[in-house]
């Protein structure tokens, strides 16, 4: 028998600092967690202890903090260099700032495979590609070779900028060649490393021939066997057990995000390359573990960069940027205006000339929205004062609703209207109407929602059964201001870009802002 | 950029062992490779083996297994090579080499010098 | 022996283009390892010329092009100079030998 170890990590988005347990800035740091300092000390430890280790990253290492915004994904390449990472796969988030931006911060100086089976170049970018990415790569560990095919979310169109020239086929469909063709190469030990979710990575461990273990990411899964460490609460035991198709019991693993943890896989082959055993857990990367010294170290030099960044001028408001809780926890503010039409516009994909757009609306919690931003101070808007604005580190993510779930979110927004709670709704793309003299939960009249599937876009009445995307904050996604019918209702969640590099890209590409308080939340005649 | 900087010529007897040291200067020796490769006289290019100093981890061709022994001091920034049971057709150029900045874990951006050892009969 | 199989010698006139190729199986190019070439020039050491099949390290002019197809990778310089004269060598990883191997090397000469 031979065993691998295999450590893996997947959406870290850009937390290459530690961070409080809730993934959020540091504050106090003997309690906080996770960054590259620490997981380097994690990865060193058992590198030295153990004799066949990987070190796999399953995608979404871009985008997530100003780290991302400021480095443009070089640190990303610069940090797993340092940490010596085996292999990547590519994530829907890597392809956030266009292939430019990942073909030369990332693919052309990181120092290990990256991965995708399912992504094939056309045109022009296919031979300035080449080679850049793999299907697959074999890896030598120890005396033995192990394969890893890379996949990522056949959705990556919809929720990043990968352009027209590449395509993304279905994952099952594009793995099976490869995995067989590593097969003919007598490689007998194969693992398939992605970023498509869960219930994507169950589905490979149980039609892909040929695969012995899956590692994923984009669904932030959390897997553990016994009491959890932490807050997070498990989707199932770690590994996840899935019996394929062909009768193999094949482990399924991912590791939360946000470098919170280390995925920690033992797995056991027998001589013809079959699984005899697999265990393990992911590991908290909490203040227990010391940051390495000379990674800390690099990080810290690289940090006075992102200090210096924070304090320069995005571009300019010429109106008071309406951010109190007076305004924007009771009526339409400009800023909640602002932030949603910052969302759309960072989720602009035309991949379909029957849609102006795939997605036109946004709800934000008001709550959400913590500091106005004063014009009188020669109009400028840093990222600084964006940071007082959000300061929750939060995303903007891309969800799929039906029509009786959102009724009853702005149902939510004001059932105790008037206390100065969050959960009231800032939104774009809809024209709300309510009327406060009825009963909680018969408030909204009129729900006026923007159309997609259409070449001028117009104002149509909401319709209870039909599928709506809308972009929302993280927080509302997972039920936070009590909006717990989006959790359970939702039909589709993807995580998006961080809130403040939403906002800052918008604002720097319109260069002077103005929005207004123009009617898209009304209270009814009589009732307000 | 990383340096290396190799100790001098040696001239053993077949038999014994010699051990050459290859120091990193300028850079972040301990998260790249150390390999050593030897060449000898109007020959190619032969690898022995690497180690990878953060980790303590090494490889070693099969040729050389149990002969040779590559170590890796943090503190100081030298990686050793040590070849024992000396024979004549171990006279070569020895070199380090290692990965420095390019984007390849396996290839050889920088080269120590090189150090003659001769194997005297 | 070399795990790598290059030819011992080509040669071109300054202003030609040559080819030097590195032939392997299945268990080292065939299996998709990366290709390094490397450039000796006489009594120096070895000095990487391109990784990873197609890619030039920094202050290699791109006269130099790499290539791979099947279990054979190839090292071409366009518009030879007479400082090109050099030995050159195909690096790549063997699956067989459980460790890195190099062609045997090729001679250039620029007459």
């Known amino acids: 028998a031979w065993e691998l170890t295999i450590l893996h990590t997947n959406d870290v988005h850009s937390r290459l600092e530690q961070t409080s347990e809730d993934s959020s800035k540091c504050v106090n740091a003997s309690r906080c967690m996770g960054g590259v300092a620490r997981l380097f000390t994690k990865v060193q430890q058992i590198r030295r202890a153990e004799p066949n280790v990987l070190l796999l990253d399953a995608g979404d290492q871009y985008q997530g903090t100003i780290w991302f915004t400021v480095y443009k994904g070089a640190e990303v390449a610069h940090f797993m260099n340092a940490l010596r990472y085996d292999a990547m796969a590519l994530g829907n988030h890597e392809f956030d700032n266009g292939v430019e931006g990942l073909i030369e911060p990332l693919l052309k100086e990181a120092k290990f495979p990256i991965l995708s089976a399912n992504i094939k170049a056309k045109g022009p970018l296919a031979s300035q590609i080449s080679g850049l990415y793999l299907p697959y790569k074999v890896l030598p560990v120890g005396d033995e070779v192990v394969g890893i095919v890379g996949y990522t979310s056949k959705e990556t169109p919809f929720l990043s900028n990968p352009g027209t020239n590449l395509v993304f086929e279905d994952e099952i469909t594009a793995l099976q060649p490869e995995v067989d063709k590593l097969k003919t190469l007598n490689v007998n030990k194969i693992i398939a490393l992605g970023h498509s979710g869960f219930e994507m990575d169950k589905l490979i461990a149980q039609k892909v021939r040929g695969v012995d273990v899956v590692v994923g990411g984009h669904s932030n899964t959390f897997l553990y066997t016994g009491n959890p460490p932490s807050k997070e609460v498990p989707a199932g035991k770690y590994p996840f057990i899935v019996t394929s198709d062909d009768g193999r019991k094949v482990p399924v693993v991912q590791a939360y995000a946000f470098g919170k943890y280390l995925g920690y896989l033992k797995i056991e082959f027998d001589e013809r390359g079959n699984v005899i055993s697999s265990h393990g857990n992911p590991i908290l990367l909490n203040s227990s573990i010391p940051e390495d010294p000379s990674i800390k170290a690099d990080i810290n030099k690289w940090r006075i960069k992102l200090d210096n960044y924070s304090t320069q001028e995005l571009g300019k408001t010429i109106v008071y940027l309406d951010g109190s809780s007076q305004s924007c926890r009771f009526r339409e503010c400009n800023m909640g205006n602002l932030i949603c039409d910052a969302m759309i516009n960072n989720n602009l994909r035309h991949t379909d000339e029957m849609f102006w757009n795939h997605v036109s609306m946004c709800i934000l919690n008001g709550g959400g929205i913590r500091s106005p931003i004063d014009e009188r101070n020669n109009g400028t808007i840093t990222w600084e004062n964006l940071a007082a604005v959000l300061p929750f580190g939060g995303t903007f993510d891309l969800v799929q609703l039906k029509g009786s779930t959102l009724k009853k979110a702005f149902e939510h927004s004001v059932h105790r209207y008037g206390q100065s709670t969050g959960e009231f709704l800032q939104v774009g793309g809809i024209h709300v109407v309510y009327d406060l003299s009825r009963k909680p939960g018969d408030r909204v009249v009129k729900l006026d929602v923007l159309c997609t599937k259409c070449r001028v876009p117009s104002y149509d009445p909401l319709k209870m059964d039909e599928v709506y995307k809308v972009i929302l904050p993280n927080f509302l996604a997972n039920g936070g201001d009590g909006f717990q019918m989006i959790k359970d209702e939702l039909l589709r969640h993807d995580s998006g870009d961080q809130d403040i590099n939403v906002v800052s890209t918008y604002i720097s590409k319109m260069k002077v802002i103005y929005p207004a308080v123009e009617g898209r939340i009304k209270f009814s005649t009589g009732s307000h | 950029q990383v340096q290396l900087v190799q100790s001098g010529a040696e001239v053993k007897k077949s038999g014994s062992s010699v051990k050459v040291s290859c120091k990193a200067s300028g850079g972040t020796f301990s998260s790249y490779a150390i390999s050593w490769v030897r060449q000898a006289p109007g020959q190619g290019l032969e690898w022995m083996g690497r180690i990878i100093p953060i980790f303590g981890t090494t490889n070693y061709a099969q040729k050389f297994q149990g002969r040779v022994t590559i170590t890796a001091d943090e503190s100081t920034s030298i990686a050793y090579m040590e070849l024992s049971s000396l024979r004549s057709e171990d006279t070569a150029m020895y070199y380090c080499?290692?990965?420095?900045?390019?984007?390849?874990?396996?290839?050889?951006?920088?080269w120590g010098q090189g150090t003659m050892v001769t194997v005297s009969s | 022996q070399a795990v790598l199989t290059q030819p011992s010698s080509v040669s071109g006139a300054p202003g030609q283009r040559v080819t030097i190729s590195c032939t392997g199986t299945s268990s080292n190019i065939g299996t998709g390892y990366d290709i390094h070439w490397y450039q000796q020039l006489p009594g120096t050491a070895p000095k990487l010329l391109m990784y990873r099949f197609t890619r030039r390290p920094s202050g290699v002019p791109d006269r130099f092009s790499g290539s791979k197809s099947g279990t054979s990778a190839s090292l071409t310089i366009t518009g030879l100079q007479v400082e090109d004269e050099a030995d050159y060598y195909c690096q790549s990883y063997d699956s067989g030998q459980r460790g890195w191997v190099f062609g045997g090397g090729t001679k250039l000469t620029v007459l």
């Open positions: 080499a290692s990965d420095g900045a390019v984007a390849a874990y396996d290839a050889f951006l920088i």
